[in-house]
């Protein structure tokens, strides 16, 4: 019968032959009356035996990500009748893995979109690198993976990839973040390779701003002869958020005349000054209102950016007609 | 690492002028507004000026109008104080100060987020 | 012109609570920062647009603003909390900031 145990060759040995092991049957008694010969798939190129002892040589480089197997048939020959030995045998050399490859993150470019000022541990984004080494030949292709840039606002899971905030984010300070990751395999140990990838992380807004007057006095004039709902000018509050979260309604909060009203022009975001009552110069030639801006929609869990409206102070002149 | 520094300072007499420098490193300049700050010996903190990060609008405490010019070089990574007839009670330690806020924002709502060490300034006889 | 008010000095025994006041007309309409500034040193933003914290600011310090008065808490006092105090708005295009407060922990 056939003799042999498991054949290995580690992939990228460089040496011009590398002996792999023995392939012999028992019946050889050793003195040189067989003759052994290799077929198949890399018979000859890759490998070659020694056809008096049986031994196996690799004479080339191998790459096991190329190839990680090969299978090949042996035969013994009986050298003074030409017959066989022992029938045809077919044995495989397994590639052994060394760790010749970094990992790689496949899924690049990275992007992710989270809500500005969300809590500490929000999940952003997992990002997974791909190792091209053996998963089962030791640590090899066993991943960590860190952060390079991204601290203080973000963290990494060491094994998982997934990204989290671990600390709030304001988007009106900044509104984006390119986190630099790295995936080392040999899980960190010495001799280990390494790959990076850069996620971009947006911010999206939240109503966490409440709009506020940019002038705390504003001087405006109304002629006596004006009639009701006459425009006598607008009033401009600022919010740094954006979208539906700039959203403002303007509103009247003291005028003890009842004179005046505010409406809100939705393209503009402007507060507009409108006479409710008609106004005589005789009876009384200025007024003093004072209007307040809010917000068109807050979600209660944002309230505490909102707590007191921003008011302004308006002061109208009225300006006289000659009366016939 | 974000940085402000601030040159320019010195010993200058009664309605004469000095220019204050500001030198900023570590982000982006041209995306800021920047503010001036001073500090008289012993005093707290009043502001002088600010000015937008493109330029375009600036504002002054009324201590100084008239009197200090705000302005900035983008391509410089530079932020300047001209302080023109000066008064002894302008003696002060000068801040530069980065406005936090994304272009786009209005009003100083998110405070100065970076301050520069500071240069003495004294106006004397 | 806007005013901001702050009283001269707050002490506090280690461990404690020392709560700062700003007060100014209507303040709790706009927005108030703090700073914190010890001897020799720049100025340090520590709270910003009433109750936000800026990065690397300990959860010990925080903000709250209503009606005329904004009030910067710090629980835990430390040692290391001594300096002058200082609350800044906004009104009218301009900056307004408080007259500083010294706190001093006993």
């Known amino acids: 019968g056939w003799v042999w145990n498991q054949f290995f060759v580690p992939e990228e040995m460089n040496t011009t032959s590398h002996h792999i092991g023995q392939l012999r049957s028992d019946l050889d008694n050793g003195n040189n009356s067989f003759q052994y010969k290799l077929l198949g798939a890399g018979a000859g190129s890759t490998f070659i035996i020694d056809e008096r002892t049986g031994d196996i040589y690799a004479i080339q480089k191998l790459d096991r990500e190329e190839r990680s197997l090969y299978i090949l048939r042996a035969q013994v020959i009986d050298i003074a009748t030409g017959r066989a030995v022992e029938p045809e045998s077919e044995f495989v050399i397994k590639v052994s893995d060394i760790n010749d490859n970094e990992p790689k993150f496949l899924d690049e470019p990275y992007e992710a979109i989270v809500p500005e000022m969300s809590p500490e541990g929000t999940l952003v984004i997992q990002v997974t690198a791909s190792d091209a080494d053996d998963p089962s030949s030791g640590n090899n292709a066993r991943l960590l993976y860190s952060l390079l840039q991204g601290q203080p606002y973000f963290s990494v899971e060491p094994t998982t990839g997934v990204i989290r905030i671990s600390s709030k984010m304001d988007r009106e300070l900044q509104d984006e973040y390119w986190v630099i990751i790295q995936a080392k395999d040999m899980i960190g140990q010495p001799g280990a390779l390494s790959g990076t990838t850069s996620v971009l992380i947006k911010l999206s807004d939240v109503n966490d701003n409440k709009p506020i007057f940019k002038e705390s006095l504003y001087r405006l004039t109304v002629s006596e002869s004006a009639p009701t709902g006459t425009s006598i000018g607008t009033i401009m509050a600022y919010d740094n958020d954006i979208g539906e979260n700039a959203e403002m309604d303007y509103s009247i909060e003291e005028d003890d005349s009842q004179t005046f009203d505010i409406i809100t022009n939705h393209e503009t975001q402007e507060g507009i000054v409108i006479l409710k009552k008609k106004v005589d110069f005789e009876h009384q030639n200025h007024y003093g209102i004072r209007a307040k801006v809010k917000n068109h929609h807050v979600p209660e869990q944002l309230m505490k950016y909102h707590t007191e409206a921003s008011t302004t102070f308006i002061k109208i002149q009225v300006e006289d007609v000659d009366e016939p | 690492q974000v940085q402000l520094v601030e040159s320019g300072g010195g010993v200058v007499q009664p309605g004469r002028s000095l220019r204050l420098s500001c030198a900023a490193s570590?982000?982006?300049?041209?995306?800021?507004?920047i503010h001036w700050v001073r500090q008289a010996p012993g005093k707290g903190l009043e502001w002088v000026a600010v000015i937008w990060y493109d330029g375009s609008n600036k504002y002054y405490a009324d201590s100084v109008k008239g009197r200090f010019t705000i302005s900035r070089d983008n391509s410089k990574n530079t932020l300047y104080l001209q302080m023109n007839s000066l008064r002894a009670e302008d003696s002060a330690v000068y801040y530069c100060a980065r406005r936090a806020g994304i272009p786009g924002t209005t009003g100083y709502y998110y405070g100065m987020d970076v301050w520069g060490q500071g240069t003495t300034v004294t106006v004397s006889s | 012109s806007y005013e901001l008010t702050q009283p001269p000095s707050v002490s506090v025994s280690p461990g404690q609570t020392a709560s700062i006041t700003c007060s100014g007309d209507r303040l709790g309409e706009k927005y108030v920062s703090w700073y914190q500034q010890k001897p020799g040193q720049s100025p340090i933003l520590v709270i910003y647009?009433?109750?936000k914290w800026p990065s690397g600011i300990p959860e010990r310090f925080s903000g709250s603003n209503s009606g005329n008065t904004a009030t910067l808490t710090i629980s835990g006092t430390q040692a290391m909390d001594e300096a002058d105090y200082y609350c800044q708005a906004w009104d009218s295009s301009t900056v307004v900031f408080g007259g500083g407060t010294k706190l001093t922990v006993l």
């Open positions: 570590g982000f982006t300049f041209s995306r800021y507004g």
């Open positions: 647009q009433d109750n």
